[in-house]
């Protein structure tokens, strides 16, 4: 071909796969006529024929161009639809008049890669290895022409290193003519990589320019022998009786290794094993104070048979022992004296308090309760608190009961019942005194009586309301060595006068009931009227 | 007949470095932990290393961790000891060991010893 | 650490008689679930490696003459040779393995 030792540089056209190309004959029209043309593609620097044009009018040659070519833009671009890979050749129009005269196009295929996948090696890395070994896999699929890979470990590029890093690249060709990438990363990894972050990255180019993909990052398990155990106790901070402890076994090698948690027995002096979960934890719960003590942790590696041992570790579990109180069941007659006083042991120090039963009251501060010129009043519950005050929730109580002597004390003197008449009544009545007194009713019916506590006594009577009831009403009597005492429940007739608009007429009308702390809590339907305190 | 037979020792300098090697042989090499025992002279005996069957795993003793490195090559039936800034207080005959089939540490098989002298 | 402490440091036994060798752990060397004991011992005779006699304690080496016993248990231990030969004089070493390694001084036995 005339002239072909000088021949310009072909123009470049760059495309990706699967769209359309437009190669444009550059021809001037001194050098040809653009109505008259042929287009050639040149592989392994082979002519064929692949167009023709005349009198503008294009016509595919039979072969692989055949479906995919046609004229554009007055004839002067040839479109070619679908590239491939295989397109990426030279392409050239050669006019026939008035000189016979060609252009050429360096048509340049693209693809970008899919996503790099990454593959950790699965099995690990011992840190001892004497050579690099394999850390990951690196596949970029369907990319042309082929991209290049970087491997980066904690966002720092890696660099190949003679014995310490080493990166091998291959790379397929698919039936596309794409190009699949695979990468191994090889590299003598340090204890101090169990945390490093790998990914590779894949640089491509484009028609828009240069581009990139990152994979997601990976860390590789990276194995390395105990050098230390130690152990860890949960919750931090002081212990108390009741909570739940875990004692942890750690080690820093990878992997773990197999633990045992001992106890120190100081009678024996032998460390004796405890029983610990499936995860090598021992469970304390609760936690009792016997568990206090000296705990260390064994640790094996099998691989050696070297065994290692923890510093060992004092747990104290705090507690309170339980509470006694002197004298425990006091006896007092109204207007002496009495002291009361607690005592507990403890891992820590202690606070004493005294506190009311009934009320809650905190009557002294100290283990220490003295009581002077003691009335009925006094009677009752009296609870020693002995608690660590560093500690929350650390304390155990006592409760003592005093018992005051006395002849009976009714919970009322009087009260009115409101009745029906054939109703069945049930009347209550309680007393209290020391000693236990009991209760009489004047009237026949079915009695029964219960302790409210060891010197209160509640007694209830079902009785059948008749006219002579209602003329005596019903007298209940309490007794004791001391003395007796009565109370009288008047009972009256029921009518609609009597009822109040917020009265409950349904429930209760054949129930009296009362006690010492709620005066005259009567469920039933009688008005409450003033009365005076009892006190026998 | 099991058979381990060091080599490697010598006179060298305070700072300087040695590798001992143990040639090992009449047993199935990569299945056994191998450790290294020294004996200073007329003195008792100290551990100096151990190395598990497939080489990942390794200990030392506090007085030679950093210092010293113990390697194998199971393809070789060797056993090496890589001992970097010596002191006069390693002047001692090196033997190579191997553990035997029991649930714990024992060195079952010594060699006969190298003798490695640091002084300048 | 563990330290080991032999006693006596060295022993002199006529042919024939019994020879005891102490050794004191610092701490118990008893693993309680398996109810055994890391400790071995070891026999020097003079210009050659040691070999090993005893582990577990008490458990002899196979080929171990059974003259020598070992007995013991948590901190204390002891190597026994109920009737002293000839061969027999050598340097003898108390081990552990409870934490990492660690051997007794030696005891020097000798014959009287």
């Known amino acids: 071909v005339p002239g072909e030792a000088e021949q310009p540089a072909p123009e470049l056209v760059e495309v990706e796969v699967g769209s359309t190309a437009l190669l444009k004959c550059g021809l001037s029209q001194s050098q040809g006529n653009l109505s008259h043309v042929d287009w050639f593609s040149v592989h392994k620097e082979k002519r064929t024929l692949i167009f023709r044009v005349r009198q503008g009018q294009g016509q595919s040659e039979p072969g692989e161009y055949e479906q995919r070519l046609s004229l554009q833009d007055r004839g002067a671009t040839l479109a070619l639809t679908q590239v491939t890979p295989q397109d990426e050749r030279i392409f050239l129009c050669q006019g026939k008049r008035p000189r016979s005269q060609e252009y050429r196009i360096q048509l340049r295929v693209y693809k970008a890669p899919e996503e790099p996948n990454i593959q950790v090696n699965p099995l690990g890395i011992p840190v001892n290895s004497k050579e690099p070994e394999e850390v990951a896999t690196c596949v970029g699929r369907n990319g042309y022409p082929i991209p290049q890979v970087i491997w980066y470990k904690n966002g720092r590029p890696l660099k190949e290193e003679k014995n310490r890093v080493h990166i091998q690249s291959s790379q397929t060709v698919e039936s596309s003519g794409l190009y699949t990438l695979q990468s191994i990363l090889k590299a003598q990894l340090v204890k101090e990589d169990k945390d490093a972050q790998f990914y590779c990255e894949l640089n491509y180019r484009l028609p828009s320019g240069n581009h990139m993909k990152e994979s997601r990052e990976v860390t590789v398990p990276v194995f390395y022998p105990t050098e230390k155990v130690w152990l860890e106790v949960e919750p931090v901070g002081m212990l108390k009786e009741g909570d739940r402890v875990e004692i942890r076994c750690l080690a820093d090698g990878n992997p773990p290794p197999h633990f045992s948690i001992s106890k120190g027995n100081p009678s024996t002096r032998e460390a004796e094993e405890e029983t610990t979960n499936d995860n090598g934890v021992l469970v304390l719960e609760p936690a009792r104070k016997e568990h206090s003590g000296r705990y260390e942790c064994q640790a094996w590696n099998l691989d050696t048979m070297i065994s290692l041992l923890s510093e060992p570790q004092e747990l104290l579990v705090n507690y309170v022992s339980d509470v006694r109180v002197s004298p425990a069941a006091p006896e007092r007659q109204e207007g002496s004296s009495l002291t009361l006083t607690c005592e507990a042991e403890s891992s820590q120090d202690l606070e004493f308090q005294w506190l009311r039963e009934e009320t809650d009251q905190v009557l002294e501060r100290g283990p220490v309760l003295q009581l002077h010129d003691l009335k009925r009043e006094a009677g009752g519950g009296y609870r020693c608190v002995a608690s660590v005050p560093s500690i929350p929730g650390l304390n155990r109580t006592q409760l003592v009961k005093l018992a005051i002597f006395g002849p009976p004390w009714m919970a009322f003197k009087e009260r009115k019942v409101w009745v029906k008449e054939n109703m069945v009544l049930n009347l209550s009545c309680e007393a209290s005194g020391h000693p236990r007194p009991t209760i009489s009713w004047n009237v026949n019916g079915t009695a029964s009586e219960g302790d409210q506590d060891p010197q209160r006594v509640l007694s209830t009577l079902n009785v059948l309301v008749t006219p002579e009831l209602l003329e005596t009403g019903v007298e209940c009597t309490a007794s004791n060595d001391l003395g007796k005492n009565t109370s009288i429940l008047f009972l009256e007739l029921v009518n609609l006068t009597t009822l109040t608009p917020d009265s409950n007429t349904t429930t209760g009308l054949s129930t009296s009931t009362a006690s010492p702390h709620t005066r005259a809590n009567s469920t039933s339907t009688e008005r409450k009227l003033p009365e005076p305190e009892s006190r026998g | 007949e099991v058979q381990l037979v060091e080599s490697g020792g010598g006179l060298v300098q305070p700072g300087g470095s040695l590798r001992l090697s143990c040639a090992a042989s009449g047993f199935t090499f990569s299945s056994y932990i191998m450790s290294w025992v020294r004996q200073a002279p007329g003195k008792g005996l100290e551990w100096v290393a151990t190395?598990?069957?497939?080489?990942?795993?390794?200990y030392y003793p506090d007085s030679v961790k950093g210092r010293f490195t113990i390697s194998r090559d199971n393809a070789k039936n060797s056993l090496y000891l890589q001992m970097n800034s010596l002191r006069a207080e390693d002047t001692a005959v090196y033997y190579c060991?191997?553990?035997?089939?029991?649930?714990?540490?024992?060195?079952?098989?010594w060699g006969q010893g190298t003798m490695v002298t640091v002084s300048s | 650490d563990i330290v080991m402490t032999q006693s006596p440091d060295s022993l002199a036994v006529s042919l024939g008689e019994r020879a005891t060798i102490n050794c004191k752990s610092s701490?118990?060397?008893?693993?309680?679930?398996?109810?055994?004991?890391?400790l071995a011992w070891y026999q020097q005779k003079p210009g050659q490696p040691p070999k090993l006699l005893i582990y577990?304690?008490?458990t002899r080496e196979s080929g171990v003459p059974d003259r020598f016993s070992g007995s013991g248990s948590g901190t204390d231990f002891t190597l026994t040779i109920s009737s002293l030969q000839a061969e027999d004089v050598a340097v003898y070493y108390c081990k552990q393995s409870y934490n990492l390694l660690t051997f007794g001084q030696g005891t020097k036995v000798e014959i009287k």
């Open positions: 577990w304690a008490s």
């Open positions: 060991t191997r553990d035997d089939d029991y649930d714990v540490k024992v060195f079952a098989y």
């Open positions: 701490r118990s060397l008893l693993n309680s679930r398996i109810r055994k004991n890391y």
């Open positions: 190395i598990s069957s497939g080489g990942s795993s390794t």
